[in-house]
Amino acid sequence: DAHKSEVAHRFKDLGEENFKALVLIAFAQYLQQCPFEDHVKLVNEVTEFAKTCVADESAENCDKSLHTLFGDKLCTVATLRETYGEMADCCAKQEPERNECFLQHKDDNPNLPRLVRPEVDVMCTAFHDNEETFLKKYLYEIARRHPYFYAPELLFFAKRYKAAFTECCQAADKAACLLPKLDELRDEGKASSAKQRLKCASLQKFGERAFKAWAVARLSQRFPKAEFAEVSKLVTDLTKVHTECCHGDLLECADDRADLAKYICENQDSISSKLKECCEKPLLEKSHCIAEVENDEMPADLPSLAADFVESKDVCKNYAEAKDVFLGMFLYEYARRHPDYSVVLLLRLAKTYETTLEKCCAAADPHECYAKVFDEFKPLVEEPQNLIKQNCELFEQLGEYKFQNALLVRYTKKVPQVSTPTLVEVSRNLGKVGSKCCKHPEAKRMPCAEDYLSVVLNQLCVLHEKTPVSDRVTKCCTESLVNRRPCFSALEVDETYVPKEFNAETFTFHADICTLSEKERQIKKQTALVELVKHKPKATKEQLKAVMDDFAAFVEKCCKADDKETCFAEEGKKLVAASQAALGL
């Protein structure tokens, strides 16, 4: 439906509060280095303009597209070239190229200071002094650090952030109330950002078809009672929502997401029996709840898949008539029967089925050619099952920290060219699969583990894309979205790698390590471990373990010493010498 003024349409649909919040998120995701105050000023100007268009849709410039309006506004920033360099060249382009240019300059790892959490009294004071500014600042800080964060979901996080402060700043023990809530929001926020980053990568690097395939599989698992036509409609709508958000069209995205939630709730009887509670909630909670809703029960007595997809004489006819529809039906039918499979496995099976049909439908006897296609699935299913079994056993044996260390060593040997901070971050996240998924029963392990690993490996891919250093990473990241994890799993030690020169400074530690949190201390030790492997890629597990045990003892000893700094200096030299000897450096 065409509107005279798109900006007026979205302002009226979303309301002023959400409109302003979404414009702020959009601007902060594009211009990640701009100060908060500058963004607020731009947002206020856009909002005032939108109000004039609501009053009179025929007013000057009200007919312009949102990209034109927002792009023009962003291009008024005075320090664009000094701050962003070549991104300023985007402003010389016309829409839609200008917006594409801004999108290409989004930085997944912006050079921004770590967010330091102030004292609780200071945070509560800031919250009470100006609640609106405090919450805007939250949106701004998250959006600029996570330029692909799912904007309507960020509104939900902000609502929970506000609730945490409203409750805890009037609590007796404010810190005990607030800090766990903020930790939870931080951890959930990072996970949400990473999940959305994979959706955007899927759309942008592999296209709409890849995303739709993912959505068919996931929604069919979640809504196994829904008809194929219903799932297809949901997939189409969901693809539109995510295409918009990943493309920076946040107002349209939020509006369409609200419409989709409304549609799902109005039609829950034909979608899922699990939606009732979600649909009683307010909009932001409702949309979040639907996105996280548990899988519905599978319909009883589903017929065998073989009848329609192997045994039928019409397989090639049906495939030829509408390839994607037929493959979509295959994926739907397979996924609704297999909530125990990861989405990426289901997509691998569908790809195998497609490849077989492409080959066999051109053969002399198609039916005889594809008759055993389901047998080809067996090794594809067993590979992730075995991998998860082995890694969960290792996790249970080692615990999370040591399991992360095992993965650090494994991945550093596979791709030693990758920067140490990236290897540490990615391996730590890979290691979290243990505590996240290994506690689940067999039927839930694979969807939990492999789909989580897809999200984490995508972090590696987007960080590596910014500064490519390894052909092996590039290959695994770009060849096939669904085979990324098997591709990385299959990598062996990189024999072409020339070990890094030894630098004593890398292994010099100071008393400040003693005041770090347990998590930060682990990161320091894991950083040292990666560096060790980069120096000595052929070091055995036993050698590395011995050095790391000595290192842990050294830190513990010096942190107990009266003169910590002297201890770190003197004992540190001894440790470096001993480690070099142990590793034969």
């Epitope: 004292e119 509560c124 004071t125 919250f127 009470h128 002094d129 409203t166 409750e167 009037q170 609590a171």
Partner: antibody, heavy 124, light 107 residues
Framework: QVQLLQSGAEVKKPGASVKVSCKAS????????ISWVRQAPGQGLEWVGW????????KYAQKFQGRVTMTRDTSISTVYMELSGLKSDDTAVYYC?????????????????WGQGTLVTVSS | ELVLTQSPSSLSASVGDRVTITCRAS??????LNWYQQKPGKAPKLLIY???RLESGVPSRFSGSGSGTDFTLTISSLQPEDFATYYC?????????FGQGTRLEIK
């Protein structure tokens, strides 16, 4: 302006219960906690407990644990304090008071607005 | 529980006098101390929060100081309307506690 309006005086027999109400106006009710403080005739101030108006969570002084219940009705911006098993030494003026916001970097939980007080007399 | 001891329990002073009331905590309470004024038959009124911050609308002749365990409330020049009972209150830990009060009367 910010106001806390309490219910009227009560006379109760020992062993009975009393429920005092405190209606807030002039501010966002769920943004501020409410404390209850009592004052026996000619005596000092004694803290009874506190309610988080946002979550409904409560904290009571040990002395009143098991006898006091604080609740709130956000739809009418009202807090209630019910004290059961009344004894003669529960005779006092009961005040509700608003916990002030954190200001200038400190959450002093000062009681910045007080109700007018409700006299509860326990007598056989 | 944390005990607050006010001194003196009562004092007599004249209009224009400088008056100091002290409040000692049985353990450190940082700056989580507030001062109230109460007149007969009325509810208490907040004067000072966070040990030294003047509540808005309170005359500047009132001031507070201290941290840890020792705190003072000072009235620089007594006015007729200042004759009342003064209470300190700590909010560092639950249960919240009040001092026993200091009665300030006209000499």
């Amino acid at each position: 302006q910010v106001q806390l309006l309490q219910s009227g005086a009560e006379v109760k027999k020992p062993g009975a219960s009393v429920k005092v109400s405190c209606k807030a106006s002039g501010y966002t009710f769920t943004s501020y906690g409410i404390s209850w403080v009592r004052q026996a005739p000619g005596q000092g101030l004694e803290w009874v407990g506190w309610i988080n108006t946002y979550s409904g969570g409560t904290k009571y002084a040990q002395k009143f644990q098991g006898r006091v219940t604080m609740t709130r009705d956000t739809s009418i911006s009202t807090v209630y304090m019910e004290l059961s098993g009344l004894k003669s030494d529960d005779t006092a003026v009961y005040y509700c008071a608003r916990l002030g916001h954190c200001q200038r970097g400190i959450c002093s939980d000062a009681l910045d607005t007080w109700g007018q007080g409700t006299l509860v007399t326990v007598s056989s | 529980e944390l005990v607050l001891t006010q001194s003196p329990s009562s004092l007599s002073a004249s209009v224009g006098d400088r008056v100091t009331i002290t409040c000692r905590a049985s353990q450190s309470i940082s700056r989580y101390l507030n001062w109230y004024q109460q007149k007969p038959g009325k509810a208490p009124k907040l004067l000072i929060y966070g040990a030294s911050r003047l509540e808005s609308g309170v005359p500047s002749r009132f001031s507070g100081s201290g941290s840890g365990t020792d705190f003072t409330l000072t009235i620089s020049s007594l006015q007729p309307e200042d004759f009342a009972t003064y209470y300190c209150q700590q909010s560092d830990s639950v249960p919240v506690t009040f001092g026993q009060g200091t009665r300030l009367e006209i000499k």
